[in-house]
Interface confidence: medium
């Protein structure tokens, strides 16, 4: 499944959503040998007052939420973004067609929060 | 000035915006002694393809941007969020009316990026 992005007006709270990324879909199959894709996940949802503890909100996000309540046309709500990311290992071709095994940082969402 | 949140359709790219937060506006003047407020800043703007180097995008954000191009109804663009935050020192009254000097982490946006 591509994902479950909620486009309706009444969006749910900030959380982690399923997302499998196929390297073939991205057109990267010519240089990535393995894996064929990976579970990347993504973050989406509202960061509305009050920010619950599970929303991993920073102090700044808490302040920004309060300012948004007072001045909604001037300051946006904080946004739902990854708070922790994991790496994946990839076998790929370099520019000289050598096969390289490399760890790519910050590829997989582990948790989401309001920032 | 409260901020310069752009609500028009054609939003500018993800960047740091001015925001001065008054503790009086937040209703915190009874327990925060000093300062009266602080320059908090906030992040806002589009994280659209292609993500430039100054957008401090994570690998995941780069992948998500490409997936959004293919499946815009299913996966959102990455969001513009703080990449670095600074602390501020605050003088305040605790529950026993003692005056406390405390450093509050993650209160000021230093830089923004696509996440």
């Amino acid at each position: 499944s591509v994902g479950d992005y909620n486009t309706s007006e009444q969006k749910q709270a900030c959380k982690k959503h399923e997302l499998y990324v196929s390297f073939r879909d991205l057109g990267w199959q010519d240089w990535i040998i393995a894996p064929e894709g990976y579970a990347a996940f993504y973050c989406d949802g509202e960061c509305s007052f009050p920010l619950n503890a599970h929303m991993n909100a920073t102090n700044h996000a808490i302040v920004q939420t309060l300012v948004h309540l007072m001045f909604p046309d001037h300051v946006p709500k904080p946004c739902c973004a990854p708070t922790k990311l994991n790496a994946i290992s990839v076998l790929y071709f370099d520019d000289s067609s050598n096969v390289i095994l490399k760890k790519y940082r910050n590829m997989v969402v582990r948790s989401c929060g309001c920032h | 000035s409260v901020g310069d949140y752009n609500t028009s359709e054609q939003k500018q790219a993800c960047k740091k915006h001015e925001l001065y937060v008054s503790f009086r506006d937040l209703g915190w003047q009874d327990w925060i002694i000093a300062p009266e407020g602080y320059a908090a800043f906030y992040c806002d703007g589009e994280c659209s393809f292609p993500l430039n180097a100054h957008m401090n995008a994570t690998n995941h954000a780069i992948v998500q941007t490409l997936v959004h191009l293919m499946f815009p109804d299913h996966v959102p663009k990455p969001c513009c969020a703080p990449t670095k935050l600074n602390a501020i020192s605050v003088l305040y009254f605790d529950d026993s009316s003692n005056v406390i000097l405390k450093k509050y982490r993650n209160m000021v946006v230093r830089s923004c990026g696509c996440h």
């Epitope: 040998i33 076998l91 067609s97 096969v99 095994l101 | -």
Partner: nanobody, 117 residues
């Protein structure tokens, strides 16, 4: 034309081991990667491992239990499967990616692995 022949499958008890081989013959341009896939009845094909000169990568479900290796002189790739579980039961296929190809252009016929509990 390139032929891939898998061997080494069979019936084994849970906790046991098997060693699969995949021998490539024919007009090979030089293989960049040999991958192992498996397909259990009624399930989608699952990537198991990819063996290259640059390193070997494993699927999460077999990491730490399966080991891939290759013998370039024999154009053969091996999959050593230890600590087998009933959920490893499947037909195992090998696939060859040659130099200049953007995917796996040759596939073997498969070898059955059955793990009983």
């Amino acid at each position: 034309e390139v032929q891939l022949v898998e061997s080494g499958g069979g019936l084994v008890q849970a906790g046991g081991s098997l060693r699969l081989s995949c021998a490539a013959s024919g007009s090979i341009r030089g293989f960049v990667a040999m991958a192992w896939y498996r397909q259990a009845p009624g399930k989608q094909r699952e990537w198991v491992a990819t063996v290259t000169n640059g390193g070997t990568l494993y699927g999460d479900s077999v990491k730490g239990r399966f080991t891939g290796s290759r013998d370039n002189a024999k154009n053969t790739v091996y999959l050593q499967m230890n600590s087998l579980k009933p959920e490893d039961t499947a037909v195992y296929y090998c696939a060859l990616r040659q130099i200049g190809a953007s995917g796996y252009d040759y596939w073997g016929q498969g070898t059955q692995v059955t793990v009983s509990s």
